[in-house]
């Protein structure tokens, strides 16, 4: 059940968006941690990757993720939810050929092996938040963000734009 065939095929794309060009505008290798400085780690178990949210021991090496940035254009006359203009989207890859995917049906964040072009489930609108934090909004499900739940990554529905600053959907990116 691991691989592209397991990815749910959702048709509701974020704001009917189109990603400009197929190649990323830039890439960035960073470690990912929560607002409370817990590290996001990736472990290979039974031929599939698991994602953990944990406190690392001092001097323990942090896992890195390759963020690929894409420009996304959202014409206001096409968007049904009042969002228009230019946005930055990212894909996140902790290791070659594997990408974080939003499984909206299970409200989970999973690592899937797949080939390019990547499915919509691998794309997230990147939000530049306060306190040097970012948030990741699902392209396939507006208002749903990657968040932390029970020491795992999960998809969390933000019921109001005014709740965008809740700590469990805020992440820090660091080169170290």
């Amino acid at each position: 059940a691991f691989g592209i065939s397991g990815v749910q095929k959702y048709t509701r794309a974020l704001h009917d968006s189109s990603i400009t060009g197929i190649s990323p505008i830039t890439e960035y290798l960073a470690s990912l941690s929560t607002y409370n400085d817990q590290s996001i780690t990736f472990a290979l178990e039974d031929e599939s990757y698991e994602i953990y949210v944990e406190d690392l021991k001092k001097d323990e090496k942090k896992d890195k993720v390759l963020l690929s940035y894409y420009e996304s254009q959202h014409p206001s006359n096409e968007s049904g939810d009042g969002v228009d203009g230019k946005m930055l989207m990212v894909t996140l890859s902790p290791t070659k050929d594997f990408w974080l995917h939003a499984n909206n049906k299970e409200h989970s964040v999973e690592l899937h092996k797949c080939e390019k072009p990547l499915p919509d489930q691998a794309f997230f609108v990147l939000h530049n938040m306060h306190s040097n934090c970012v948030s990741f909004e699902c392209k396939t499900d507006p208002g749903v963000f990657i968040g932390v739940k029970d020491n795992h990554l999960a998809l969390i529905k933000v019921d109001s734009s005014e709740n965008l600053c809740t700590e469990n959907i805020l992440f820090k990116l660091s080169e170290t």
């Epitope: 830039t26 969002v83 228009d84 203009g85 939000h127 530049n128 306060h130 734009s161 709740n163 965008l164």
Partner: antibody
Framework: EVQLVESGGGLVQPGGSLRLSCAAS????????MNWVRQAPGKGLEWVAE??????????DYAESVKGRFTISRDNAKNSVYLQMNSLRAEDTAVYYC????????????WGQGTLVTVSS | DIQMTQSPSSLSASVGDRVTITCRAS??????????MNWFQQKPGKAPKLLIY???NQGSGVPSRFSGSGSGTDFTLTISSLQPEDFATYYC?????????FGQGTKVEIK
């Protein structure tokens, strides 16, 4: 059509107060951070204030030159952002622009046409 | 605060010329692998219009003759072939953190 329309500008005496309004239309207002930027006659652009989104309180930031005198606020139900300006000085004379950041808060994307504030006795 | 220094403050050019404007930040405006550097065009009596965001990406409806480059502290706006409607004042701005500061502007005039 995405639009920002400023109002409330005018002539005011030094030490006086003025409240600028910015009416937004064509987009879901409560999804965007809003800013005010001003431009003195014949001069460059100066950022004034920003209001973000938060469930507890709106995060607000101000330029040092207006801190303690100006207050930014928003009313999502009315799709509006405001700038309350107190203790006005001659150097506050400028065109004041209301600005919407892009979705995701990376840059200033949409600007209003501006409203002129003149502080003079 | 991050200071933005733009040069030149003004320049004279002809239609068809290649025009380059530079902007230097007092410290890096990069974060998360993105340069928080933007360029705006302003015509007399009008509001500024976004040309370039994140150093090198075009705003909506911006002609392809406008391009941006750079990272860290040094940035460039290039107009590959100046058109009559391009005579205006251009501003750089960083949006990395408050206060968001602008360059002093570059006025592009007809030679």
């Amino acid at each position: 059509e995405v639009q920002l329309v400023e109002s409330g500008g005018g002539l005011v005496q030094p030490g006086g107060s003025l409240r600028l309004s910015c009416a937004a239309s064509g987009f879901t207002f409560n999804k965007f951070w809003m800013n005010w930027v001003r431009q003195a006659p014949g001069k460059g652009l100066e950022w004034v204030a920003e209001i973000r989104l938060s469930s507890i309180n709106y995060v607000k930031d101000y330029a040092e030159s207006v801190k303690g005198r100006f207050t930014i606020s928003r009313d999502n139900a009315k799709n509006s952002v405001y700038l309350q300006m107190n203790s006005l000085r001659a150097e506050d004379t400028a065109v004041y622009y209301c600005i919407r950041r892009n979705y995701g808060n990376w840059f200033f994307e949409i600007w209003g046409q501006g409203t002129l504030v003149t502080v003079s006795s | 605060d991050i200071q933005m220094t733009q040069s030149p403050s003004s320049l004279s050019a002809s239609v068809g010329d290649r025009v380059t404007i530079t902007c230097r930040a007092s410290e890096s405006v990069d974060r998360y692998g993105i340069s928080f550097m933007n360029w705006f065009q302003q015509k007399p009596g009008k509001a500024p219009k976004l040309l370039i965001y994140a150093a090198s990406n075009q705003g909506s409806g911006v002609p392809s003759r406008f391009s941006g480059s750079g990272s860290g502290t040094d940035f460039t706006l290039t107009i590959s072939s100046l058109q009559p409607e391009d005579f205006a004042t251009y501003y750089c701005q960083h949006s990395k953190e408050v206060p968001y500061t602008f360059g002093q502007g570059t006025k592009v005039e007809i030679k």
